[in-house]
């Protein structure tokens, strides 16, 4: 089974979150994709989405969010620029496939934005998250209004307990890899 993990990104205000979501090229290349925030107990909220049909490597900007869909590589690149403390939260990529429900992509992103300098995190043996920091880097599409109840979730538990979804086997597993910490002034 594919493992669903929650990746934790710790950044400072003003920095950029720069992540990617991969998808099955043959199935979803031109499908509309979206970036959502998941708040505890609430329906996922769509913050930005690609055009419909999605255009190849054509950046779409909605406020401080930039989406870039590389059809030929099966990758959606998501950038959130000039991060603010209030951007902290759990995010996910989904693929719209009406009339079916949105298809969730791996992995979920737990974003923690802090003011000023934040120390390098240590490796936590019991953590279900990977933690790392990213250096800063520096057209609007209409999104469907509906959100599937099936994508409503809570943040993954802080244990190794399995998390199941109705139509696929997904396990939340212990992952403690820490990636390098580049520093930019």
């Amino acid at each position: 089974a594919t493992k669903l993990t929650e990746e934790k990104y710790e950044l400072k205000e003003g920095q950029t979150l720069d992540v990617k979501c991969d998808y099955t090229l043959e199935k979803f290349a031109s499908s509309q994709k979206a970036w959502q925030i998941i708040r505890d107990g609430e329906m996922p909220k769509t913050l930005a989405c690609t055009e419909r049909p999605s255009k190849n490597s054509h950046p779409v900007q909605v406020g401080r969010i930039i989406l870039e869909d590389y059809h030929d590589h099966g990758l959606l690149r998501v950038r959130m620029v000039n991060l603010q403390v209030e951007d902290s939260g759990l995010y996910q990529c989904v693929i719209y496939q009406p009339p079916k429900e949105p298809h969730m992509l791996f992995d979920r992103i737990r974003l923690v934005v802090t003011k000023g300098f934040s120390g390098t995190p240590g490796s936590n043996e019991n953590s279900t998250q990977n933690v790392y920091k990213i250096p800063p880097t520096t057209t609007k599409a209409l999104c469907p209004l509906y959100t599937s109840p099936r994508t409503v979730t809570q943040a993954p538990p802080k244990s190794t307990a399995d998390v199941s979804t109705p139509d696929s086997e997904i396990n939340l597993t212990n992952v403690t890899d820490i990636i390098r910490v580049p520093v930019f002034n």
Partner: antibody, heavy 122, light 107 residues
């Protein structure tokens, strides 16, 4: 020991296919992308594409679309790259390389296999 | 595709010399630039990522700088073991592309 171990050299005829393996050890295989890069003798480096070992999803450059297949077997921490319809200009050393974290836009290759020489000759 | 132009394609210098290699991108790559070293018959080795960050275990005699489209890789004091070909690589846009390489020799 953190390493990528590749399969041995291959000699193929034009039109045939070759499948190169890349076995990862010393780290969590499913957490980092595996990329394939090739280098013709005396030439530069050419990125072919990537594989997410967790999802199994892959992407290739336009040049190799339809000719290259990237797969993995997570039970043995091994990635594979199969190139079909071989021609003489495919003669090169093929490297697997560990990329950045699967969810991060971090495309640097910090761990490389030793390379597999594929010779295409009639 | 983003073109990466490296210069010079080869150079010869003396032990102890300061060596500089440049890499020019065909468009702004937002500091998404890495440098690799490749010794004859070996796989490439990551030296520097994101313009100026030294990979773990890489000697401080190697450094990188630049922004936008113009980047520089420097060996502050050339040593015999630095004989190799050096490549830059961008990852701001897909496909990932490499420079043509700079072969460094000792005269």
């Amino acid at each position: 020991q953190v390493q990528l171990v590749q399969s041995g050299a291959e000699v193929k005829k034009p039109g045939a296919s070759v499948k190169v393996s890349c076995k990862a050890s010393g780290y969590t295989f499913t957490r980092y992308d595996i990329n394939w890069v090739r280098q013709a003798t005396g030439q530069g480096l050419e990125w072919m594409g990537w594989l997410n070992p967790n999802s199994g999803n892959t992407g290739q450059t336009q040049k190799f679309r339809g000719r290259v297949t990237m797969t993995r077997n997570t039970s043995i921490n091994t990635a594979y790259m199969e190139l079909s319809s071989l021609r003489s200009e495919d003669t090169a050393v093929y490297y697997c390389a560990r990329g950045g974290y699967t969810s991060a836009w971090r495309w640097y290759f910090d761990l490389w296999g030793r390379g597999t020489l594929v010779t295409v000759s009639s | 595709d983003i073109q990466m132009t490296q210069s010079p394609s080869s150079l010869s210098a003396s032990v102890g010399d300061r060596v500089t290699i440049t890499c020019q991108a065909s468009q702004d790559i937002n500091n998404h630039l890495n440098w690799y070293q490749q010794k004859p018959g070996k796989a490439p080795k990551l030296l520097i990522y994101d313009v100026s960050n030294l990979e773990t275990g890489v000697p401080s005699s190697f450094s990188g700088s630049g922004c936008g489209t113009d980047f520089t890789f420097t060996i502050s004091s050339l040593q015999p073991e630095d004989i190799a070909t050096y490549f830059c690589q961008q990852y701001d846009k897909l496909p990932l592309t490499f420079g043509g390489g700079t072969k460094v020799e000792i005269e």
